[in-house]
Interface confidence: low
């Protein structure tokens, strides 16, 4: 028969023939002949290989280097990578997660619309009328403004997005 | 103010084992902000970081190639302190000892851990 | 691994001179480096962290700068006490070869 010029799913075409791939968490040791199969071997230990692959070397797992202000999130396995994060109040650069930085505070006026995680920065939004932030924060909204009516007094001095209004009592009618 | 008080001989046969502790007063070797190192200075002057150990939920050490095969740090929580092991060494160990403690400073950059805090260095030469 | 290399392995000053010391990295280390002084005979200490900014109790007149692969340690007088050797070290821990910085 004609040699195969390709080949099924999970293998591959070497010297004319169609070898298997190793599965994930296992490396190509050597390659399949006429007689023989492809032969694989589980990754070592703090290795890993995340597909049906021939590969002759594992990945090694990733470090999440303590210096970055890295732990780990998720241990890797043979098939899959370390997953890591930051430590508490720090949120990754980037979406490989390679070093940290602090989270972000709200400046007043402006109050905390999405906490901040490990992954993502903390979102700020600007305090809408009605709401006020007078702190710089990673934590709090915007706080609305204190209702005078509702304690049966007048508004002596309009809030601002900084500022809280500011109650007095109503002026008594005069004779 | 942190200090680490280095104790250990200061002469040991090839083939031995060198082994030395690091005493910590004024923190703790279970934070969760520091690392404890070993650090060597060769007669030529070199440093060398060794390894470390640190807490971070559960205990991981770190250890530089050329010593991992013989090398093992260990916290020891009950005394507050940490211990250098060196298997089989040999004259080229022979050196200067250092324990320290590393932390993040803070910084505008990424977290990065600096040696604040030395030992007072324990000479160790290698000989029969 | 990244290798780093001072230069000049000596330079020899008067007190009240200005010192340049140079730390090159063989790879960007971004702004992951810190400057240690070293006397005869006592362990290394702190000078500098993260390429610029000084340790605890240490005097204005040192100075760091760089990033990348490019840093400068800077005395701006020397004072009979800064004759030292002065390291600078990366953030996977290694250190350079030092610079003796002595008396002329």
């Known amino acids: 028969p004609e040699p195969p010029t390709a080949c099924r799913e999970k293998q591959y075409l070497i010297n004319s023939q169609c070898c298997s791939l190793c599965q994930p968490g296992q490396k190509l040791v050597s390659d399949c002949t006429e007689f023989t199969e492809t032969e694989c071997l589980p990754c070592g230990e703090s290795e890993f290989l995340d597909t049906w692959n021939r590969e002759t070397h594992c990945h090694q797992h990733k470090y999440c280097d303590p210096n970055l202000g890295l732990r780990v999130q998720q241990k890797g396995t043979s098939e899959t990578d370390t997953i890591c994060t930051c430590e508490e109040g720090w949120h990754c650069t980037s979406e490989a997660c390679e070093s940290c930085v602090l989270h972000r505070s709200c400046s007043p006026g402006f109050g905390v619309k999405q906490i901040a995680t490990g992954v993502s920065d903390t979102i700020c939004e600007p305090c809408p009328v009605g709401f006020f932030s007078n702190v710089s924060s990673a934590f709090e909204k915007c706080h609305p403004w204190t209702s005078c009516e509702t304690k049966d007094l007048v508004v002596q001095q309009a809030g601002t997005n900084k500022t809280d209004v500011v109650c007095g009592p109503q002026d008594r009618l005069r004779a | 103010q942190v200090q680490l008080q280095q104790s250990g001989p200061g002469l040991v046969k090839p083939s031995q084992t060198l082994s030395l502790t690091c005493a910590i007063s004024?923190?703790?070797?279970?934070?969760?902000?520091?690392?404890w190192n070993w650090i060597r200075q060769s007669p030529s002057r070199d440093l060398e970081w060794l390894g470390r150990t640190y807490y971070r939920s559960k205990w991981y050490r770190d250890y530089v190639g050329s010593v991992k095969s013989r090398i093992i740090i260990n916290p020891d929580t009950s005394n507050n302190q940490f211990s250098l092991q060196l298997n089989s060494v040999t004259p080229e160990d022979t050196a200067i000892y250092y324990c320290t403690r590393a932390q993040w400073l803070g910084g505008d950059y990424p977290y990065y851990y600096s040696m604040d805090v030395w030992g007072q260095g324990t000479t160790v030469t290698v000989s029969s | 691994e990244i290798v780093l290399t001072q230069s000049p392995a000596t330079l020899s000053l008067s007190p009240g001179e200005r010192a340049t010391l140079s730390c090159r990295a063989s790879?960007?280390?971004?702004?992951?480096l810190a400057w240690y002084q070293q006397k005869p005979g006592q362990a290394p200490r702190l000078l500098i962290y993260d390429a610029s900014n000084r340790a605890t109790g240490i005097p204005a007149r040192f100075s760091g700068s760089g990033s990348g692969t490019d840093f400068t340690l800077t005395i701006s007088s020397l004072e009979p006490e800064d004759f030292a050797v002065y390291y600078c070290?990366?953030?996977?821990?290694?250190f350079g070869p030092g610079t003796k910085v002595d008396i002329k």
């Open positions: 004024g923190d703790s070797v279970s934070s969760n902000s520091a690392t």
């Open positions: 070290q990366q953030r996977s821990n290694t």
């Open positions: 790879q960007s280390v971004s702004s992951y």
